[in-house]
Every structure is written in structure tokens, then in C-alpha cells.
Amino acid sequence: FGISGRHSITVTTVASAGNIGEDGILSCTFEPDIKLSDIVIQWLKEGVLGLVHEFKEGKDELSEQDEMFRGRTAVFADQVIVGNASLRLKNVQLTDAGTYKCYIITSKGKGNANLEYKTGAFSMPEVNVDYNASSETLRCEAPRWFPQPTVVWASQVDQGANFSEVSNTSFELNSENVTMKVVSVLYNVTINNTYSCMIENDIAKATGDIKVTESEIKRRSHLQLLNSKA
């Protein structure tokens, strides 16, 4: 079903992950063309009959778009001329996960590349001192995760120590019945130490650090997507 008699062009994609309920980007670049009207961008998804998105003759062409993606997709129209075919996907859904194809036609030729898109939920954890507890206790909370992550505590002073016996983790389903709130409590905390709460699933890894001294409390959070250069 392809075009015959044309050269192939280089199309490059980057595997990425989308956060359910938020907007995501499916990255795709190609060898640019000098005329916007000669560029056709088509996004397809395995398991979907219609197109995810189509951009041709300088504008969106949505008559072939599958209803699953209606009203949720856009290309960066002003960047197409410089070889950016990335797709913005609004309100990412769990079912958006899968294999996508970025298919490009220009006056130079055609090319395509696949992209694996993972979907889930991930959020920054916040670690606080729980002053309501009977002993020195830390509470690590992250509002949205899916699939269910693992939670591991670590400390700077007791490196390599296993805190599973002195911590308790719970998962509370959020109102949309997909994502969950993660709460982990660490007991018997000592002063003048830095503790890390590490939350991880197959999509993302997040760390919340807290440094507790007699005079101050310092916090830091970090989130990293896994298997992704995004």
C-alpha cells in the first residue's frame, strides 16, 4: 500500500510515557522539506482502524481520524516546516498505551518510525515529619500513581538498611477509580539524618528526600521517567 518510485527519508521517534489525565507528547522528527504544502504527517496506532491524526497541505485533515482520538490531538503546525511531526495528545487515557507509527511523506520521499507509548500515573512525593505520631515519624505522600508502585525507604546514615519492618505503606484509590494515592509512614526516625522515600513502577521513579536536623528541615523531590529519553 506504499508509494513507489520515491526515496525514503529518515524519521525518528522517541519512546515516551503519558500521565493519565494530563497532556502528553509523542515525539517524531523528520528530514524537513522547503514547502509546507508538500508535507503529509500521519499518526497511526496499532489496534485502531482510523488515523490518530493527519496533517496535510498545511492543516489538519480530520475526516479519517478515529473517534477514540477526536478532539485530543494536535501537531505543532509552526514547527512542521523544520521537521517536527510530534503529536500533542490531550487528556491521556490508560487505553492510549501501545505502538504508534509516525508516517511522513514529503517531496523528497517517505518514511516512518514506530514509537512505544506507555501510560500510567506518576507524581512527586512529599515527605513531612508527622508530629501527630507518638514517636518520630515521617510521612511520604504522592497523590497519583498507576500501576501500583513499590515504595522503599532509605537513609544516608544507615545505607543499605532495610526499613520494611519499620514502615507501613497504603494505597488509596482516587475518585476516578484508576489512579491511587500512595502514603508511606516510616517509624523510629533519628535526627540529623537524610531519609529518602522512593516510589517506582514500570513507568516512573520518584524520590522524596527529607533532611531532619535540630534546627531545620530540608526537602527535595525528583521524578524520572523510565525507558524513555523524554
Epitope: 500500500f1 506504499g2 508509494i3 503529509v40 500521519q42 497511526l44 496506532k45 496499532e46 489496534g47 485502531v48 482502524l49 482510523g50 488515523l51 480530520l62 475526516s63 479519517e64 481520524q65 478515529d66 473517534e67 477526536r70 478532539g71 505502538t99 507509527k101 508516517y103 511523506i105 517517505k110
Partner: antibody, heavy 115, light 113 residues
């Protein structure tokens, strides 16, 4: 110019199967769905299902689920529609059509089911 | 599934006169975010496959004479031929492509009076 060329007329016995082909030329087809639409004598148009040739993803109308199989061979730019357990009511002209919006059609293949 | 119902089933109109065919969908085919109606009209002449005339309810396909026009929104649509020509004798179908399965109206046969 886009062209869809279908295989020739078929006469089949009740209970047997028929496989109709649709060869595409003159454009980029692997990205657009190839749909199959049938028309019984003197009747209207009925969507049977379609396939995304690039991924081989097929979708079928509920009425034909389990009886129809739509496939595509990218190397030959050909889509196929196989209908099994044929009955006399399946006597119809079967069309392939490109895209969700059927801009391009095959010429049609008459399938006659008769004992 | 969305059910498409056309009226009338058949229509006889004099050459040069206006022909009007109606199509009603069992649910709206208007997508409010882009204000587009996912409705198309096809013409089918005897022994031929259907031919796309109009999509988005009112956009003429390239090469279609301007005597053909489409109108309507939501659930009620109309195909109008402003001045009937002999070559317009055919069966006309409306089609919704809002959701899968794609569905067609039962067709309207247009003849010359």
C-alpha cells in the same frame, strides 16, 4: 490517481466461503483503512468492516462478527475479505472502499450464493 | 449503532427543477468541539459503485458540480440539487462517519418527472 481493483464474480454454494480481493494502486494506502461494504440486489449499502493495512488491525460490524475476516498484504497492496457459512441472503455486490470517508471505491464483486 | 433514515424513498422531479432529499440520524453526528457534522452524501448510478458528493454535511468533494449542496446539523440533514440534470438520475445515500460502525441511510431514488 487512486484505483481499487477487485477480483471477479463468484458463484458459491450455501455453507461455503468466498474470498474477495481488492488491489490498490496510485497512492499511499497503508495508512488509510480499507473498508468493505456490501449491497444486496435492489438494496442499500451495508458496512461490513475494515482494516488498517499498516498494522493489520481489523474491525467488524456486529452482524458479521465471527463470519467475516478482513486481511491485508502490504507487499502486494491488496486487501481481502473472506465471508464464511454463506447463505442465499449473502448474495450481493461486495465493494472495497478506501478510508473512513469512502472517497475511492472498487468496481464491486458480485457474489451469488445458490444451491 | 446510529440509524440513518432518509426521506422520501423515491422522488420524481422535472429537469431544471430543485430536488431535495432529507436524512435523519438517530443521534447527533455533530462534534461540538470542532463544530463539524460527520455526515456524507453519496450518489450511485446503476451498475456503478457509489461516488462521494459531500462530506462534513456541506463540503463538496472536488469535481462535484455546484448544483449539489448539503445543509443541516446535529440530526437533520438535506441534500439539494438546485437544477436537476438528466445525469443526476441515481440513488442517493447519506452516511454517518461519526462512530464505528459506519452506517448508511436506506437510499433515495431520484427520477425525472
Amino acid at each position: 490517481q487512486v484505483q481499487l481493483v477487485q477480483s471477479g464474480a463468484e458463484v458459491k454454494k450455501p455453507g461455503s466461503s468466498v474470498k474477495v480481493s481488492c488491489k490498490a494502486s496510485g497512492g499511499t494506502f497503508s495508512t488509510y483503512a480499507i473498508n468493505w461494504v456490501r449491497q444486496a440486489p435492489g438494496q442499500g449499502l451495508e458496512w461490513m468492516g475494515g482494516i488498517n493495512p499498516m498494522f493489520g488491525t481489523a474491525r467488524y460490524a456486529q452482524k458479521f462478527q465471527g463470519r467475516v475476516t478482513i486481511t491485508a498484504d502490504e507487499s502486494t497492496s491488496t486487501a481481502y475479505m473472506e465471508l464464511s457459512s454463506l447463505r442465499s441472503e449473502d448474495t450481493a455486490v461486495y465493494y472495497c472502499a478506501r478510508g473512513r470517508l469512502h472517497r475511492h471505491w472498487g468496481q464491486g464483486t458480485l457474489v451469488t450464493v445458490s444451491s | 449503532d446510529i440509524v440513518m433514515t432518509q426521506s422520501p424513498d423515491s422522488l420524481a422531479v422535472s429537469l431544471g427543477e430543485r430536488a431535495t432529499i432529507n436524512c435523519k440520524s438517530s443521534q447527533s453526528v455533530l462534534y461540538s468541539s470542532n463544530n463539524k457534522n460527520y455526515l456524507a452524501w453519496y450518489q450511485q448510478k446503476p451498475g456503478q459503485p457509489p461516488k462521494l458528493l459531500i462530506y462534513w454535511a456541506s463540503t463538496r468533494e472536488s469535481g462535484v458540480p455546484d448544483r449539489f449542496s448539503g445543509s443541516g446539523s446535529g440530526t437533520d440533514f438535506t441534500l439539494t440539487i438546485s437544477s436537476l440534470q438528466a445525469e443526476d438520475v441515481a440513488v442517493y445515500y447519506c452516511q454517518q462517519y461519526y462512530t464505528t460502525p459506519i452506517t448508511f441511510g436506506q437510499g433515495t431514488r431520484l427520477e425525472i418527472k
